[in-house]
Amino acid sequence: MSVTACQGLGFVVSLIGFAGIIAATCMDQWSTQDLYNNPVTAVFNYQGLWRSCVRESSGFTECRGYFTLLGLPAMLQAVRALMIVGIVLGVIGILVSIFALKCIRIGSMDDSAKAKMTLTSGILFIISGISAIIGVSVFANMLVTNFWMSTANMYSGMGGMGGMVQTVQTRYTFGAALFVGWVAGGLTLIGGVMMCIACRGLTPDDSNFKAVSYHASGQNVAYRPGGFKASTGFGSNTRNKKIYDGGARTEDDEQSHPTKYDYV
């Protein structure tokens, strides 16, 4: 895969992932009422990071925001923070990567500057994706813990006034936002890795520059017309491109593993 293609694909994948992270953060269905093995109620509860909602069988849906900061569980605050960090880093990553794209010419920006920016954006996307994945996983862990706690309460007869009145505890299970978040985080991470791979293809080899300084005098060029080109690599773009493409391809083959994030 060419450097431009790898960089472009990395950018697009990260962009899709970033959009998914925003969508997941805004979604109301982080946790949804568990309907399995539960008394069937005519209301359906679901909760997001910012508000909780109730949908009645009449179709009427009412959502209430969490209008408190101090009263919210620390874990929920942490998840919010992780998702926001993911979004902020994603925004910066996108802005940086736009300027870093090889297909976009901005002033007299050389390849080494673009390489640095590509690497920066790649790292930002990687951290953004990891941040989202951690955020979603923390929330999922919180749900699992609460689910089994409420299940234990449900079957140990703790609900109600001394067992006289049955109180049904609403159990919550994974909502759609968790799966969106995991996939989105994974895509952002993969896109970031692709950007980092593309950066290697954009970076001119340091040894080539050293060769230029050793053969700076004009007489060397006169005596060894092909030597200068061969040693610097400036005349051997095709060969170098092949090496970089080979590197990119090999890295891509190794990077087939991170797609496991799509299925977490």
């Epitope: 009422q33 109620t41 509860n45 109730v54 009645e56 179709g59 505890q169």
Partner: antibody, heavy 118, light 113 residues
Framework: EVRLQQSGPELVKPGASVKMSCKAS????????MHWVKQSHGKSPEWVGY????????GYNQKFKGKATLTVNKSSSTANMELRSLTSEDSAVYYC???????????WGQGTLVTVSA | DVVMTQSPSSLTVTAGEKVTMSCKSS????????????LTWYQQKPGQPPKLLIY???TRESGVPDRFTGSGSGTDFTLTISSVQAEDLAVYFC?????????FGSGTKLEIK
């Protein structure tokens, strides 16, 4: 104005079946579930079940499973309930009712009186 | 199924009097998601379908006189008529709107002296 117009009274023999209708007007028929309620003379109402006019999905009170079948005709904005294998226990007024906030029944049909008699 | 128990079964009052009737459910009708109680009160006059008075245990349906007030939470609910009028002669039913199957109470018959 929301209106639920039910079909007229029915006198049927034991073991027979009866099908009653409920024509809705004044609102978008497919937007709200239609519920059916049975009320025997001098007794409290009993919820029979509901039908989602949009998807056709139904939910029944276990007591009426196999007894009642709910259907809809979207084109005529009509909900139907068929009762089969009728006995004297099935003699009652049957109401269709449209759900509202709090899952309450704000709109009711005038009722269909079903009398099962030999 | 959720059992709804209403008391008293009948009440005889004079016009202008304050009336309270009770409804108890075998399971809590409080939804934790919105802190609302899914209990409805209906008024049924002879030969008519029930008429919605109160939903969410305390929210008065539009057009219902403000002398009708619903209160309570969880399993214990009350319908209060602050000043009974002659036209309030009817049977009052409470209904569980939270669990399927929806269930009604046996009713409280209000009679005027």
């Amino acid at each position: 104005e929301v209106r639920l117009q039910q079909s007229g009274p029915e006198l049927v023999k034991p073991g027979a079946s009866v099908k009653m209708s409920c024509k809705a007007s004044g609102y978008s028929f497919t937007d709200y579930n239609m519920h059916w309620v049975k009320q025997s003379h001098g007794k409290s109402p009993e919820w029979v079940g509901y039908i989602n006019p949009n998807k056709g999905g139904t939910g029944y009170n276990q007591k009426f499973k196999g007894k009642a079948t709910l259907t809809v005709n979207k084109s005529s904005s009509t909900a139907n309930m068929e009762l089969r294998s009728l006995t004297s226990e099935d003699s009652a007024v049957y109401y269709c009712a449209r759900i509202w906030y709090g899952n309450s029944f704000a709109y009711w049909g005038q009722g269909t009186l079903v009398t099962v008699s030999a | 199924d959720v059992v709804m128990t209403q008391s008293p079964s009948s009440l005889t009052v004079t016009a202008g009097e304050k009336v309270t009737m009770s409804c108890k459910s075998s399971q809590s009708l409080l939804n934790s998601g919105n802190q609302k109680n899914y209990l409805t009160w209906y008024q049924q006059k002879p030969g008519q379908p029930p008429k919605l008075l109160i939903y969410w245990a305390s929210t008065r349906e539009s057009g219902v006189p403000d002398r009708f007030t619903g209160s309570g939470s969880g399993t214990d609910f009350t319908l209060t008529i602050s000043s009974v009028q002659a036209e309030d002669l009817a049977v009052y039913f409470c209904q569980n709107d939270y669990f399927y199957p929806f269930t009604f109470g046996s009713g409280t018959k209000l009679e005027i002296k």
